[in-house]
Amino acid sequence: QQQTLPKPFIWAEPHFMVPKEKQVTICCQGNYGAVEYQLHFEGSLFAVDRPKPPERINKVQFYIPDMNSRMAGQYSCIYRVGELWSEPSNLLDLVVTEMYDTPTLSVHPGPEVISGEKVTFYCRLDTATSMFLLLKEGRSSHVQRGYGKVQAEFPLGPVTTAHRGTYRCFGSYNNHAWSFPSEPVKLLVTGDIENTSLAPEDPTFPADTWGTYLLTTETGLQKDHALWDHTAQNLLR
């Protein structure tokens, strides 16, 4: 006999990276018929929602109107059908950004390179932080973590056209409080390659929104940044 229900999906709209004082909605999608959803923050009960009518609703939203550092952290949700509770969702790391200062991002040898050339990004921030994050806009949304007193190095190694795209970096004051984003740096990778198969270029998101897209899961289409979020959050953990 089944003792728990399948875990729900959790994600943030419009994004898990939320500028301070901006709004964010945490979405939890379970099953039709769920009579109660609980949102947990840092292991403690944070909010409860009871959808009406439960048989027609399989998703609830928890609205945060004014993001700040106290609201940043790890969220999870569970739901109940009758007396039976679900497994907890994966953890959602909600990050507050635009804290304190703005880092500077540069790339060596330059923003335009040849396929196969070794490329290194440098993220510099003079305020007190020792962790830096480099993010590439795009579907695969690679996130790298680096360390340094005022500057971190992010070696990409020999690049291919798959590395083309727009990059930004953040200074991280803790896992869930990040600086303003750096100005974007667009990396162009040119070069004719003989007998080399290269990965296709990543689609890139509009720089102002960091994008939205659809992710196919076993339960259908999940809107927004679930894959993107999980990539970054696995790194955070």
């Epitope: 923003p111 335009e112 070069g191 080399t196």
Partner: antibody
Framework: EVQLQQSGPELVKPGASVKISCKTS????????MHWVKQSHGKSLEWIGG????????SYNQKFKGKATLTVDKSSSTAYMELRSLTSEDSAVYYC?????????WGQGTTLTVSS | DIVMTQSPATLSVTPGDRVSLSCRAS??????LHWYQQKSHESPRLLIK???QSISGIPSRFSGSGSGSDFTLSINSVEPEDVGVYYC?????????FGAGTKLELK
């Protein structure tokens, strides 16, 4: 010590081709792209193109596409530039230069004279 | 293509002078600007990278400044061996381009 040793001066006839070499030592050849720069007599520097030795990726100045072909031989850590259909306009000193961000090391230059 | 414009074309100096060489890019290149010195019958030599970063083995009298589209190479006390042509180079976008050069000569 990083060194880029270029082949000697060339005197060739119009319409011919020539292949200039740049033998490197003192660093890992595949870790830096190699570039070629033209300097006509009394003139400034012109970037011809560059090549990444590890996978052979190339980028050319549009002006030199069809004129120059860049290749490498990883086994001997040598870069090559072939120039074809030569005319008097191609008479110049040609340099190879390693791109370590900037062009941090240069060959001594190869003088090419195209004359009948 | 990014056009690099250097001025003056020629600079006549006296040893001990402090001199400034100018380089202007036709569009912003951030700090992806490099300076080279070329003495007569020699290969170019890197002096300053990324607008202001010094190079090991280059005398400290050479310094660079600027960002965006306007850059300056300064020599704070010219020595006779500094005679030659100085080139700036766009390291931002392909095709990589050089300025026409500033010729430094002694009076």
């Amino acid at each position: 010590e990083v060194q880029l040793q270029q082949s000697g001066p060339e005197l060739v006839k119009p319409g011919a081709s020539v292949k200039i070499s740049c033998k490197t030592s003192g660093y890992t050849f595949t870790e830096y792209t190699m570039h070629w720069v033209k300097q006509s007599h009394g003139k400034s520097l012109e970037w011809i193109g560059g090549i990444s030795p590890n996978i052979g990726g190339t980028s050319y100045n549009q002006k030199f596409k069809g004129k120059a072909t860049l290749t490498v031989d990883k086994s001997s850590s040598t870069a090559y530039m072939e120039l074809r259909s030569l005319t008097s306009e191609d008479s110049a000193v040609y340099y190879c230069a390693r791109r370590g961000g900037s062009f941090d090391y240069w060959g001594q230059g190869t003088t090419l004279t195209v004359s009948s | 293509d990014i056009v690099m414009t250097q001025s003056p074309a020629t600079l006549s100096v006296t040893p001990g002078d402090r001199v400034s060489l100018s380089c202007r890019a036709s569009q912003s290149i951030s700090d992806y600007l490099h300076w080279y010195q070329q003495k007569s019958h020699e290969s170019p030599r890197l002096l300053i990278k990324y607008a202001s970063q010094s190079i090991s083995g280059i005398p400290s009298r050479f310094s660079g400044s600027g960002s965006g589209s306007d850059f300056t190479l300064s020599i704070n006390s010219v020595e006779p061996e500094d005679v030659g042509v100085y080139y700036c180079q766009n390291g931002h976008s392909f095709p990589l381009t050089f300025g026409a050069g500033t010729k430094l000569e002694l009076k």
